[in-house]
């Protein structure tokens, strides 16, 4: 339904508060280096303009597209050329090329200072002094660091952020109340950002069909009682929502997400029995709750899949009549029967089935050719099952930190060209799969683990794409979305890698390490471990363990010393020499 003024339409649908918040997020995700005050000024100007259009939809410029209006506004920034370099060239383009240009310049790893959390009293004062600015600052800081963060979900995070301060700044022990809540929001926020980044990568790098296949599988697992037509409708609507958000169309995205939540709640009887509680919540909580809702119970009397997809003589006829619909039905039927499989495994099975039909339906006797197609699934199912079993055993034996270290060594040997900070970040996140998923029973392990690994490996892929250094990473990232994890798992030690020259500076530590949090100290040690492997890729586990144990003892000893700095200088030289000898550097 066409509206005379798109900006007025969205302002009225979303309300002023959400409109302003979403425009701020959009601008911060595009111009990630701009100061907060500049963005607030731009947002206020857009909001005032939107109000004039609400009053009179025929007013000047009110008929322009949102991309035109927002792009024109972004292109008024005076320092665009010196701050963003070639991104300023986007402003010479016309829509839709200009928006595409802005999207291409989004930076997954912007050069921004780490967010340092002030003292609780300082934060509470700032919150009370100007609540609106305080919350806008939160949106701005998250959005510019996470340029693909799911905007309507960020509104939900901001609501929880506000609630935490409202409650805790009045508490007797403000810190005890607030800090755990902020930690939880930070961790959940990083996870949410990474999950959304995979959705956008799926759409942008592999196309709508790939995203729709993912959505069919996931929604069929979640809503196994829903009919295929219902799942298909939800998939179409969900694809539109994520296409809009990933494309920077945040107002449309938030509006459509609200409509989808409304539709789901109005039709919960034909979708899932688990939606009742979600649907009683206010909008932002409702949408979040639906997105996270547990899988409904599988219908009791589902017939065997083989009848329709293997034994029937009409398989090729049905496939010819509507290939994607038939494959979609296969994926739906398989996924609703297998909440115990990862989405990526289900997609691999569907791809195998498709490949088999492509080959067999061209044969004179197709049925004879595809009769054993389900036998081809067995090794595809067993591979992730075995991998998860082995790695959960290793995790239980080592604990999270040492499990991360094992993965650090494993991945550094596979792709040693990748930057050390990226290897540390990705391997630490890969290692978190243990505490996240290994506690689950068998039936929940694979969907937890392999779908989480897909999210983490996508982080590696998007970071590597910015500055490509490894053909092996590029290959695993670009060849197949669903085979990324098996591709990385299959990589052996890179025999072509020329070891990095030894640099003592890399292994020089100072007393400041003693004041770091446990997490930061781990990162320092893990950074050193990656550098060790880059210097000596053929070092054995035993050699690396010995050096790392010595290193831990050295840090502990010097942090207890009276003259810490002298200890680090003198003992550090000895440690470097001993390590060089132990590793034959």
């Amino acid at each position: 339904d066409a509206h005379k003024s798109e900006v007025a339409h969205r302002f009225k649908d979303l309300g002023e508060e959400n409109f302003k918040a979403l425009v701020l997020i959009a601008f911060a995700q595009y111009l990630q280096q701009c100061p907060f005050e500049d963005h607030v000024k731009l947002v206020n100007e857009v909001t005032e303009f939107a109000k004039t259009c609400v009053a009179d939809e025929s007013a000047e410029n009110c008929d322009k597209s949102l991309h035109t209006l927002f792009g024109d506004k972004l292109c008024t920034v005076a320092t665009l050329r010196e701050t963003y370099g070639e991104m300023a060239d986007c402003c010479a383009k016309q829509e839709p090329e200009r928006n595409e240009c802005f999207l291409q310049h989004k930076d997954d790893n912007p050069n921004l200072p780490r967010l340092v959390r002030p003292e609780v009293d300082v934060m509470c004062t700032a919150f009370h002094d100007n609540e609106e600015t305080f919350l806008k600052k939160y949106l701005y800081e998250i959005a510019r660091r996470h340029p693909y963060f799911y905007a309507p979900e960020l509104l939900f995070f901001a609501k929880r952020y506000k609630a935490a301060f409202t409650e805790c700044c009045q508490a007797a022990d403000k810190a005890a109340c607030l800090l755990p809540k902020l930690d939880e929001l930070r961790d959940e926020g990083k996870a949410s950002s990474a999950k959304q980044r995979l959705k956008c990568a799926s759409l942008q790098k592999f196309g709508e069909r790939a995203f729709k296949a993912w959505a069919v599988a996931r929604l069929s697992q979640r809503f196994p009682k829903a009919e295929f037509a219902e799942v298909s409708k939800l998939v179409t609507d969900l694809t539109k929502v994520h296409t809009e958000c990933c494309h920077g169309d945040l107002l449309e995205c938030a509006d459509d997400r609200a409509d989808l939540a409304k539709y789901i709640c109005e039709n919960q009887d034909s979708i899932s029995s688990k939606l009742k509680e979600c649907c009683e919540k206010p909008l932002l909580e409702k949408s979040h709750c639906i997105a996270e809702v547990e899988n409904d119970e599988m219908p009791a009397d589902l017939p065997s899949l083989a009848a329709d997809f293997v034994e029937s003589k009409d398989v090729c006829k049905n496939y010819a009549e509507a290939k994607d619909v038939f494959l979609g039905m296969f994926l739906y039927e398989y996924a609703r029967r297998h909440p115990d499989y990862s989405v990526v495994l289900l997609l691999r099975l569907a791809k195998t089935y498709e490949t088999t039909l492509e080959k067999c339906c061209a044969a004179a006797d197709p049925h004879e050719c595809y009769a054993k197609v389900f036998d081809e699934f067995k090794p595809l199912v067993e591979e992730p099952q075995n991998l998860i079993k082995q790695n959960c055993e290793l995790f239980e034996q080592l604990g999270e930190y040492k499990f991360q270290n094992a993965l650090l060594v494993r991945y550094t040997k596979k792709v040693p060209q990748v930057s050390t900070p990226t290897l540390v970040e990705v391997s630490r996140n890969l290692g978190k799969v243990g505490s996240k998923c290994c506690k689950h029973p068998e039936a929940k392990r694979m969907p937890c683990a392999e779908d989480y690994l897909s999210v983490v490996l996508n982080q590696l892929c998007v970071l590597h794409e910015k500055t490509p250094v490894s053909d092996r990473v590029t290959k695993c990232c670009t060849e197949s979305l669903v085979n990324r994890r098996p591709c990385f798992s299959a990589l052996e030690v890179d025999e072509t890698y020329v070891p990095k020259e030894f640099n003592a500076e890399t292994f020089t530590f100072h007393a400041d390490i003693c004041t770091l949090s446990e997490k930061e100290r781990q990162i320092k040690k893990q950074t050193a471990l990656v550098e060790l492997v880059k210097h000596k890729p053929k070092a054995t586990k035993e050699q690396l363990k010995a050096v790392m144990d010595d290193f831990a003892a050295f840090v502990e000893k010097c942090c207890k010393a009276d003259d810490k700095e002298t200890c680090f200088a003198e003992e550090g030289k000895k440690l470097v020499a001993a390590s060089q000898a132990a590793l034959g550097l």
Epitope: K313, A362, D365
Partner: nanobody
């Protein structure tokens, strides 16, 4: 929208010949094996012959082997059945199908063999 339109049937004397055609549209014809199936009055469908997508592999029911020849022209998206030495028991509605299906998705063409 998949469409299969058969033609070429008719009344023929025993020992005579007919050439049936099946014009296909709405799918990638050359990527699919095709079959001819027939259904005599009061009987179930009977598979007659099949051909692979490239036209290299052909299969026949024992009852028609040596008398019928299946072929295809992928450029014209058309399937053929050359029927020689026709017998009264060949009387049926003939229809073409995709893959090994015996489900009737088209009108078919009537073949009557009678003196």
């Amino acid at each position: 929208q998949v469409q299969l339109v058969e033609s070429g049937g008719g009344l023929v004397q025993p020992g005579g010949s007919l050439r049936l055609s099946c014009a296909a549209s709405g799918f990638t014809f050359g990527s699919f094996g095709m079959s001819w199936v027939r259904q005599a009055p009061g009987k179930g469908p009977e598979w007659v012959s099949a051909i692979d997508g490239g036209g290299a592999d052909t299969r026949y029911a024992e009852s028609v082997k040596g008398r019928f020849t299946i072929s295809r022209d992928n450029a014209k998206k058309t399937l053929y059945l050359q029927m020689n030495s026709l017998k009264p028991e060949d009387t049926a509605v003939y229809y073409c199908t995709i893959g090994g299906s015996t489900s009737r998705g088209s009108q078919g063409t009537q073949v009557t063999v009678s003196s």
